[in-house]
Amino acid sequence: MMTGTIETTGNISAKKGGSVILQCHLSSTMAQVTQVNWEQHDHSLLAIRNAELGWHIYPAFKDRVAPGPGLGLTLQSLTMNDTGEYFCTYHTYPDGTYRGRIFLEVLESSVAEHSARFQIP
């Protein structure tokens, strides 16, 4: 039975040209996280963090995606095209798959704030 829940940074905004941290956190389960996949609104795979093998940033995003902090992902040099949904998929044993959603809005405005529901140090 899947008892866990995914908390995410929810709806966030960030300034064009800046960077943003995407974070998901799996709680309320003792399941082992074997892999976390990060993907974009169009199903593009951004990155994978495998428990045994470490991080992989997919070739198309190597220039502006950085692993971490933690199991999160940092997007850099943001463009307006980065606006949209992002998904974290936690592959766990024995529970199975948990999926979280984040909506990022990239703003032209210089007063764009990056606000998060929670922060993981």
């Epitope: 993907e39 593009s44 795979l45 994978i48 495998n50 045994e52 093998l53 992989h56 997919y58």
Partner: antibody, heavy 117, light 107 residues
Amino acid sequence: EVQLVQSGAEVKKPGASVKVSCKASGYAFTNYLIEWVRQAPGQRLEWMGVINPGSGGTNYKEKFKGRVTITADKSSSTAYMELSSLRSEDTAVYYCARGEYFFFDYWGQGTTVTVSS
Amino acid sequence: DIVMTQSPDSLAVSLGERATINCKASQHVSQGVAWYQHKPGQSPKLLIYSASYRYTGVPDRFSGSGSGTDFTLTISSLQAEDVAVYYCQQHYNTPHTFGGGTKVEIK
């Protein structure tokens, strides 16, 4: 030029073990994964497991856990796959491949392992 | 494990004609699919990764598309040297799994 050169064909008896080597050249050995894939006669390709030569981290397909061991020697840029308790259904061509993480951009020439009494 | 189902099992196409191979994943794999060409007596060769990215040096007659669970490899104009078995593979999660292969022949 990237190359993966595997050891030669092996004939083993049921219950024995086999160790296949894969010598990498032409790239930074610790910057890519080494994956092991096999193909039994008339069957699809089957992924067995992977090693990160930089960290030594490994990941195995569940059905092979306890029977397969993948190792890497950084000093010689060589990866090894050892399969124990061999049975006839392990007769296959075994390939090592360089992993651009989880897809495989260069492959060894293959090593035929025959298990027969 | 994620099951990759390829269709058709075999395909006969005239030289210069289009060949289309399909691959269906048993669950969501995002764009985590690669395609390989395997000729008899040779090692497999990577053609496409991440569903639609052509690998370095692969002729542009090979293209890939799809996301989620449904994927396609297209050879736009079949050449004699394209006779081979083609495999899809999901690289979304371990264990990585391959389709059963599609044998492409000249009609």
